[in-house]
């Protein structure tokens, strides 16, 4: 016969959950599907990753995510964990938000991004809910850059970069500053391969960098390098 | 072939001046900057600090945690450079180092601040105990 | 102060490749150098400017630098392998040579 009241408690058919902290009454949930659509765009030595949330929910609208990163090298096809050399824009685990920004990068090298979803069940069962997204980074070389001469007051200096890559630069950016001032530097833009920094003082080391400046942003930096002016008496006019 | 040889007193007291010379064999002295480095038992290389002898001038520079208490002179003379560390304790027990970087320190214009380390002394063993 | 990460202990099978990293702030813009150094022994420069080797040292031992992380890489390990390894840049804020912890390599 049936019983003249419901019971107080229904167990879970299989593969649906009550989480501890879930009161007897709540309906029986389960974990999330996978993340429905996950997008990788790489802006130089950034990745943006978009996702939308899963077509099944569980039943439960405590959602996080949670993103991981692995890296390639593409000369050996050996991969990596690359959390301790990437930066996000907020931390990786326990994301609300579909979105994050994951910057540093390094050139030339293989991304794979793991976008799991989860909820307040998905730890009472052993799959996982995620999609995963590849990006292969292709920000500019870092210039290589050389002292070509030098006076009492200037230094003259080049770069190149690889041929492939001087179509998609539009602007170096040459940063100098007296070796020793951390405070003050002064910033030189230029279409060409090369610059002479003029009104520097004698017998003087200079840090000097150059940057490429690409439509995604910044290129790689080059190395910061030391260069020194002439003193007086060894003045003799750009020599090197 | 340059070589480094380095001398000095392998116990102190707490309180006691440390005092290491190195003597460089070969090569240039007035063209690098001349390092010591340290390192405590079982710990990673602290860089202590340099010196360049230019002229009559001498270029020194030091690590921030020991500058109070760090001088680094040369004999240009005799090719020799030395350290001193005042007012030693039980943290200073390490065994020190004298090093050569790789390459002159500034070559037609182009400078090497922080070069590599190509040649090492043989290491001192300097013990701080009462 | 520049500071350089370096992770306390790598293992890896002989006749493996052994990757030690060197962390630090846009560590690509400065020249890295890596020593050896075995028990009882100086310290041996095995790579300098990122890349490139002192006579002597074998082509297993190679090196590259970009973004934040540096990396020494040691091809076809064997037994004789088995040392610390320390980064080193000089920091041209401060004016100063810094070194990374060291890195334990063991040759399983």
């Known amino acids: 016969l049936p019983s003249p009241e419901g019971a107080t408690s229904c167990e879970c058919e299989e593969g649906f959950f009550r989480a501890p902290q879930d009161p007897a009454s709540m309906p029986c949930t389960r974990p999330p599907s996978a993340p429905h659509y996950l997008t990788a765009v790489g802006m130089g030595a950034k990745v943006e990753l978009r996702w939308t949330p899963p077509q099944d929910s569980g039943g439960r609208e405590d959602i996080v995510y949670s993103v991981t990163c692995e890296q390639c090298w593409p000369e050996s096809g050996e991969c990596g964990p690359c959390e301790a050399s990437v930066r996000y824009s907020e931390p990786p685990h326990g994301l609300t938000r579909t979105s994050v920004t994951v910057s540093d990068l390094e050139p030339h090298m293989n991304y794979t991004f793991t976008v799991e979803a989860r909820n307040g069940v998905s730890g009472l069962v052993t799959s996982r809910s995620f999609r995963t997204a590849s990006v292969s980074i292709n920000q500019t070389e870092p210039p290589k850059v050389r002292l070509e001469g030098r006076s009492t007051t200037s230094l003259s200096v080049s770069w190149s970069i690889p041929p492939p890559q001087q179509s998609r630069v539009w602007k170096y950016e040459v940063t100098y500053r007296k070796k020793g001032d951390s405070n003050s530097y002064n910033v030189r833009r230029t279409e060409g391969f090369s610059v002479t920094l003029d009104d520097l003082a004698p017998d003087t080391t200079y840090l000097v960098q150059v940057q490429a400046l690409t439509q995604e942003g910044q290129g790689a930096g080059s190395k910061v390098h030391e260069f020194q002016t002439l003193s007086p008496e060894g003045s003799g006019n750009l020599a090197v | 072939q340059v070589q480094l040889q380095q001398w000095g007193a392998g116990l102190l007291k707490p309180s006691e001046t440390l005092s290491l010379t190195c003597a460089v064999y070969?090569?240039?002295?007035?063209?690098?900057?001349w390092s010591w480095i340290r390192q405590p038992p079982g710990k990673g290389l602290e860089w202590i600090g340099e010196?360049?002898?230019?002229?009559?001038?001498?270029?020194?520079n030091y690590n921030p945690s020991l500058k109070s208490r760090v001088t680094i002179s040369v004999d240009a003379s005799k090719n020799q450079f030395s350290l001193k560390l005042t007012s030693v304790t039980a943290a200073d027990t390490a065994v020190y180092y004298c090093?050569?970087?790789?390459?002159?320190?500034?070559?037609?214009?182009?400078?090497?601040?922080?070069?590599?380390?190509?040649?090492w002394g043989q290491g001192t063993m300097v013990t701080v105990a009462s | 102060s520049y500071v350089l990460t370096q992770p306390p202990s790598v293992s890896v099978a002989p006749g493996q490749t052994a990757r030690i990293t060197c962390g630090g702030n846009n560590i690509g813009s400065k020249n890295v150098h890596w020593y050896q150094q075995k028990p009882g022994q100086a310290p041996v420069l095995v790579v300098y400017?990122?890349?490139d080797r002192p006579s002597g040292i074998p082509e297993q031992f190679s090196g590259s630098n970009s973004g934040n992380t540096a990396t020494l890489t040691i091809s076809r390990v064997e037994a004789g392998d088995e040392a610390d390894y320390y980064c080193q840049v000089w920091d041209s804020s401060s004016d100063h040579l810094v070194f990374g912890g060291g890195t334990k390599l063991t040759v399983l």
């Open positions: 070969g090569g240039s002295f007035s063209d690098y900057y």
């Open positions: 400017d990122d890349s």
């Open positions: 090093a050569k970087p790789l390459r002159p320190h500034c070559t037609n214009g182009v400078c090497y601040s922080g070069d590599a380390f190509d040649i």
């Open positions: 010196v360049n002898h230019r002229g009559s001038i001498n270029y020194n």
